[in-house]
């Protein structure tokens, strides 16, 4: 029966005399007067079975002690650790000619585990063991014992097992501990590949190549290999495994992504938090599900936020010129969280009596630059029929519009072709300029061509260059534009609308807001 003693993970003990409970019962030759089993007490008052011999009075000693059979367990090279104490011959009076301070270590390979006798000729010598000059002092009971430790190795071994033997040639010695072990590279995980317990090679310089197997929930990137060195250390890791989609590395294992996290590919990355507007409800998610009303386009990466279709374009303006219409609008207030916004134009031809009875315009109508996928916020429509009502819808679309099309994403305008619109306004004036407002006034167009229903003022900051403009409509020929920024240049255009549609915009009026109130009269061109 052996007790448990702790040794390095890369050593597998085949024999440990210190762990044996009761007598060791090794074979001594001669049976009497040579090696003798003696029990001593260690520092915890636990008995240690030791073998001692002290035949120092007589010359030509030849006392043998043989262990029981030791199984090899597949090891090709084994190590023998001997802890022993040796009495200095000087401490023994009158024995100078006969006392020795060394002993010899032998081994004999055998498949027979029941050999009863020591046949000296069968044994091969491993080494002569001498006490080191340096020794550890170990407490044995109340006294300090000088303990030497020597390690020898032997190999290659080929039979099922072997015996060790100790030959005394006249020393005063005690074997306090004999441990036989082999070295292995212990089971380990490197780069997510598991490498099994591997017995070291036969030579002290040999390397054993070992192929690893990917841990659960991982896959090979490059074939994982390592080399088991003779000292039981793993060397030169090559290749690796990667955690599968939905899993990440934690302490050498591939753990499923937590709820609310995901991993799309087999990479060495960690699980990532679900992007905005998405969630995962299971562990091990490879992607996250979009929230209600949010979508992911086919070519969107799993790492991208879920998005939604845009809202309708703003500030749609039409300008009819006989059988042509120019449409202009502003970007939607909400792009749905995407950059890939574009615009589609829908043209409907409607009956004069019943505007609800509309049909598609057909292929005779032409659009510049194009009808669908517009990147700009203006389009010219030509080749329309004269004296006809048309409804134009401008649809804002993005990569996920097809998943949830809705009228909320479009704005429309109805126009009638071939009725003369009013001419442009010749003179626009800035009547009063303050820090935050400009008071505008203008003349009626030279050719109203009917009753003017309203005027439309378009203005924008000069620096914005018409990219972002605002519209104010009024029935009067003047208006106060409020909410402006101080010391900022603004550009203003005004046009008139009749039943036939809008006329052209006036020439631009440029006005810079003030820091102090003043009255400035514009001349239709520039005013500062």
């Amino acid at each position: 029966v052996t007790g448990s003693r702790v040794y390095p993970a890369n050593e597998v003990t085949l024999l440990d005399s210190r762990s044996v409970q009761g007598e060791l019962g090794w074979i001594a030759s001669p049976l009497e007067g040579g090696w003798e089993e003696v029990s001593i007490m260690d520092e915890k008052n636990t008995p240690i079975r030791t073998y001692q011999v002290c035949n120092v009075m007589e010359a030509s000693q030849n006392n043998w002690l043989r262990t029981d059979w030791i199984t090899r367990e597949g090891a090709q090279r084994v190590y023998i650790e001997i802890k022993f104490t040796l009495r200095d011959c000087n401490s023994l009076p009158g024995v100078m000619g006969t006392c020795k301070e060394t002993f010899n270590l032998y081994y004999y390979e055998s498949d027979n585990d029941k050999e009863r006798f020591i046949r000296e000729s069968q044994f091969g010598k491993i080494d002569t063991i001498a006490a080191d000059e340096s020794f550890t002092q170990v407490d044995i009971g109340d006294r300090i014992m000088k303990l030497n430790t020597e390690i020898r190795d032997v190999g290659p071994l080929s039979k099922k097992g072997f015996y060790l033997a100790f030959q005394d040639v006249g020393a005063c010695i005690a074997l306090v501990s004999v441990r036989v072990f082999y070295k292995k590279c212990p089971l380990t995980v490197r780069n997510l590949a598991q490498f099994p317990d591997t017995i070291t090679g036969a030579d002290t310089s040999s390397l054993v190549e070992v192929r690893g197997s990917c841990v659960n929930n991982s896959e090979e990137k490059d074939v994982p290999k390592m080399y088991c060195g003779a000292d039981g250390e793993w060397l030169v890791p090559i290749g690796n495994c990667l955690c599968n989609a939905g899993h990440e590395e934690q302490n050498g294992e591939c753990q499923a992504c937590k709820i609310g996290y995901y991993k799309a590919l087999s990479t060495d990355a960690s699980c990532a938090k679900c992007p905005p507007h998405s969630y995962s409800v299971w562990e091990g998610a490879t992607s996250c599900t979009c929230d209600r009303g949010f979508f992911r386009a086919d070519n969107d990466a799993a790492s991208m936020p879920c998005t939604r279709p845009p809202s309708a374009p703003l500030n749609l303006i039409s300008n009819v010129n006989e059988t042509s219409v120019n449409l202009e609008w502003s970007s939607p207030q909400n792009t749905g969280g995407r950059q890939d916004i574009s615009y589609n134009v829908v043209c409907k031809k409607c009956g004069a009596g019943d505007p609800s009875k509309c049909r598609p315009c057909g292929s005779g109508v032409h659009y510049t630059p194009q009808q669908n996928g517009l990147k700009t916020t203006r389009v010219s429509i030509t080749d329309l029929l004269a004296h006809t009502n048309y409804t134009f819808e401008i649809w804002a679309v993005n990569g996920v519009s097809k998943y949830n099309p809705s009228p909320d994403q479009s704005v429309s305008v109805t126009v009638t072709t071939n009725q003369a619109a009013p001419s442009s306004i010749a003179l626009v004036q800035a009547k009063e300029v303050t820090r935050y407002s400009v008071a505008l006034a203008w003349l009626e167009p030279d050719r109203p061509n009917g009753v003017i229903l309203e005027y439309e003022v378009k203005y924008y900051e000069k620096d914005q260059n018409e990219r972002s403009y605002r519209i104010v409509r009024t029935a009067a020929r003047n208006t106060d534009i409020k909410g402006l920024n101080p010391l900022t240049s603004y550009v203003f255009h005004v046009r008139a609308r009749t039943a036939a549609g809008y006329g052209d915009f006036s020439e631009p009026l440029e006005v810079t807001t003030n820091t102090v109130p003043s009255r400035i009269i514009g001349d239709g061109a520039n005013s500062t």
Epitope: C54, E58, D142
Partner: antibody
Framework: QVQLLQSGAEVKKPGASVKVPCKAS????????MSWVRQAPGQGLEWMGW????????TYAQGFTGRFVFSLDTSVSTAYLQISSLKAEDTAVYYC??????????????WGQGTLVTVSS | EIVLTQSPATLSVSPGERATLSCRAS??????LAWYQQKPGQAPRLLIY???TRATGIPDRFSASGSGTDFTLTISRVEPEDFAVYYC????????FGQGTKVEIK
Amino acid sequence: QVQLLQSGAEVKKPGASVKVPCKASGYTFTSYAMSWVRQAPGQGLEWMGWINTNTGNPTYAQGFTGRFVFSLDTSVSTAYLQISSLKAEDTAVYYCARVRLTVYGDGMDVWGQGTLVTVSS
Amino acid sequence: EIVLTQSPATLSVSPGERATLSCRASQSVSSNLAWYQQKPGQAPRLLIYGASTRATGIPDRFSASGSGTDFTLTISRVEPEDFAVYYCQQYGSSWTFGQGTKVEIK
């Protein structure tokens, strides 16, 4: 079995000599030193010295030089203690004892039964 | 020479009790100390050598400890056959015995 056999009691007159034999059996005589111990009546033990049975080299304790001689006859595995010029104070039991040297320490592990030497006129 | 002093000179104990005997050296003898038991009319018997190692065949109720100058022999539970005189002996420098401790029945 291992034993040391000593001769029977001796009665000697002052000035005489006595030779006490100690015959070993059951082990290799020359492998162990032999010690001699004296115990006067009602007293404690006194170590007299020892002899290396392999070389014949004796070691005497203080107070046991001159009149005391250790000798051997290895052919019959026997050690001898000879005391000359006996005095009344030499009256005692004389023990031979095998000296066991070990790595952990030494001791006299096998004893003869003792020989009583009485010195009386 | 090294002088060994044993105490007490006489120890009275009842069977089954614990007995503790002391031996003090006039100078350090390291662990080079032995204990012997002697019954009336018999030769001494080696109990302990090396200060704490039991000799072959000695029951484990006998234990010993100490090093340097102070040593102790303990009989954990005294048996009837343990009543005797006990001697310590040093072999660090020459060899000498203590004067003995008699363990008698209480």
